[in-house]
Interface confidence: low
């Protein structure tokens, strides 16, 4: 079967859109006047209120949308509305950092049915900002260069879509935990793939199969960089017990939104505050998560490293391949962002069995004491760890030691750090010394070679 | 096949202007990149120009002030404007793309036959 309509075209339930084994039922999309698209405007001169905007020159041109702005749409997925306000938060952080037309695409009248019916509905909306898109363009001479989708779950492949009926011709793309079931392992067509734009960059926070973990988003990567936080499975702070979940920081509403899809909404999250951290959520290229939890992912290579999130377009290698992974772990509550360390610590003074800590200070800020090693503590080894503060603290100015027996020891040895060598992700290392030694719990402050 | 032809060089008298053009043809997807390099005998290739699809622009120190790049994303093409050329901005002029190709997900990087500037004193 196919429907038509007049401003965006014919859609039909033939393979690769229904018949398949992902999506065996045929279904077509809800007509665009039952899913509603609307497009809600913020800028920064109304960056509170917004403006209900339409393709059309008048609406337009009595808005605050301006032609010599990025723009931006932030699609929302199921069950979700355009008035949340996670959307309207993105588009705050953007103030503090850009001029923009941010503009938040409401598709509630498409997204609170059955989940199969919405997954087809994404078409009708992807549909909507494309014709948005090239009216910009035909009216405005607007580029698509310049207009960047950031889509949440069934958004993502929503924006996907818009992306493939403009020929890949918008600049870019952000997947945000794009959504899993009826969309992973079907052709390019019907899900959000790296042709759809420019550029295409992808969040996976909720990675685990739907069945039989209720994992909602891909794991599939489906972008030209695909960042995996954490691992892009479980994500830290999303196991809290019921009631901790649900009396949230952010409302009870926010609480029972996370207690319901932790993970999945987490990558919205991310993405919302890497806008005010550009440097906070460097993704490290690495073989799996495994890998870079063993701590074999460190530094950045000569290329750099990505940012996940709002500045992942300043990679210099965004588009030399598809599906580019990158790794990195986050903190457990906002501020999500983290800045990651290696340290190595070569030991002085006695034998002993115990660990070390080290703290960092620096010209931005010190960090908390971290972990370096646990074990044998001998004189002249060299241990090292990774870690990740949630300060960054700029050029390293002085380290400070301390250690800790495992077992009581009447003796009271000490020991001291030799030399401890702090390296930044972007590989530039700071080395600092010292001759002396210190007993258990004793702060030992180590000064620039 | 992606194509890219450059226009526009010639012989100027220094204190002069040129405008170089860049066309790119074929099936073209989109193009991030724009840029103008040039090389002089026996020396390697080096970047004048760049300019991104989003209009961010980056210049050699040599030609700040001088050249200016600039675009038609809908063309498909970029341009450079040469004021004031020097005696030491005799080259050729090559332009370069990051273009994806039609129906394809990675960029190539296409560079033009190129166009001699030669700039008298």
């Known amino acids: 079967k196919e429907v038509c309509y007049e401003r965006l075209g014919c859609f039909s339930d033939d393979s690769p859109w229904s018949g398949i084994t992902e999506r065996p039922l045929h279904i077509l999309p809800w007509s665009p006047k039952d899913v509603n698209t609307r497009f809600l405007l913020y800028t920064n001169e109304n960056p509170n209120n917004f403006q209900e905007v339409a393709a059309d020159s008048s609406s337009i041109s009595g808005s605050n949308f301006k032609t010599n702005r990025k723009t931006r749409f932030i699609i929302h997925g199921f069950i979700d509305k355009g008035e949340e306000n996670w959307l309207a938060n993105v588009c705050k952080n953007l103030f503090k950092v850009e001029s923009v037309n941010c503009i938040c695409v409401d598709w509630k009248g498409g997204s609170r049915t059955g989940y199969t019916q919405a997954s087809q509905n994404i078409r009708i909306v992807g549909a909507e900002v494309a014709y948005f898109v090239e009216f910009l363009q035909s009216a405005f001479g607007y580029s698509p260069s310049n207009v960047h989708v950031i889509g949440h779950s069934l958004g993502a492949h929503a924006a996907g879509e818009a992306g493939r009926r403009t020929n890949g011709t918008i600049g870019r793309i952000t997947g945000l935990d794009p959504a899993e079931p009826c969309f992973q392992g079907t052709p390019e067509l019907v899900r959000l793939d790296p042709s759809d734009a420019k550029f295409v960059d992808v969040i996976h926070t909720d990675g685990a199969p739907i069945v039989p973990n209720l994992g909602f988003g891909m794991s599939q990567v489906v972008g030209h960089l695909d960042f995996f936080p954490n691992g892009g499975v479980e994500m830290p702070g999303c196991k809290k017990n019921i009631l901790s979940q649900i009396v949230d920081i952010d409302g009870i509403w926010e609480g029972t939104r996370d207690f319901a899809a932790c993970n999945h909404l987490r990558s919205y999250k991310y993405y919302t505050d890497s806008i005010v951290n550009p440097d906070g959520f460097a993704g490290f290229p690495c073989a799996s998560y495994n890998v870079f939890t063993a701590n074999k992912c460190f530094p950045c290579p000569s290329g750099g490293c990505p940012q996940m999130g709002h500045y992942a377009d300043r990679y210099p290698g965004k588009t030399n391949d598809v599906g580019q992974k990158f790794y990195l772990d986050t903190g457990d509550a906002s501020n999500f962002a983290r800045w990651r360390y290696k340290v190595s610590v070569t030991l002085s003074g006695k034998k002993v069995t115990g660990h070390i800590l080290v703290s960092l200070f620096g010209n931005k800020g010190n960090s908390k004491q971290y972990e370096i090693f646990k074990g044998t503590l001998k004189p002249d080894s060299t241990h090292s760890n990774e870690f990740d503060s949630d300060v960054d603290v700029g050029d390293l100015q002085m380290v400070k030691f301390i250690w800790y027996n495992n077992v009581i020891n009447p003796t009271l040895p000490r020991v001291g750090a030799s030399k401890i060598i702090v390296e930044t992700n972007v590989g530039k290392q700071f080395n600092f010394c010292s001759p002396e030694t210190v007993r258990e719990e004793v702060l030992l402050t180590l000064t620039p070679c | 096949q992606v194509q890219l032809q450059e226009s526009g060089g010639g012989l100027v008298q220094a204190g002069g202007s040129l405008r170089l053009s860049c066309a790119a043809s074929g099936s073209i997807g989109s193009i991030h990149t724009m840029g103008w390099y040039r090389q002089t005998p026996g020396k390697e290739r080096d970047v004048v120009a760049t300019?991104?699809?989003?209009?961010?622009?980056n210049y050699a120190d040599s030609v700040k002030g001088r050249f200016t790049i600039s675009r038609d994303n809908t063309l498909n093409t970029v341009y450079l404007q040469m004021n004031d050329l020097k005696p030491e901005d005799t080259a050729v002029y090559y332009c370069?793309?990051?273009?994806?190709?039609?129906?394809?997900?990675?960029?190539?990087?296409?560079w033009g036959q190129g166009t001699l500037v030669t700039v008298s004193s």
């Open positions: 370069n793309a990051d273009v994806r190709p039609y129906r394809t997900s990675r960029y190539l990087e296409v």
């Open positions: 300019i991104q699809d989003g209009g961010s622009t």
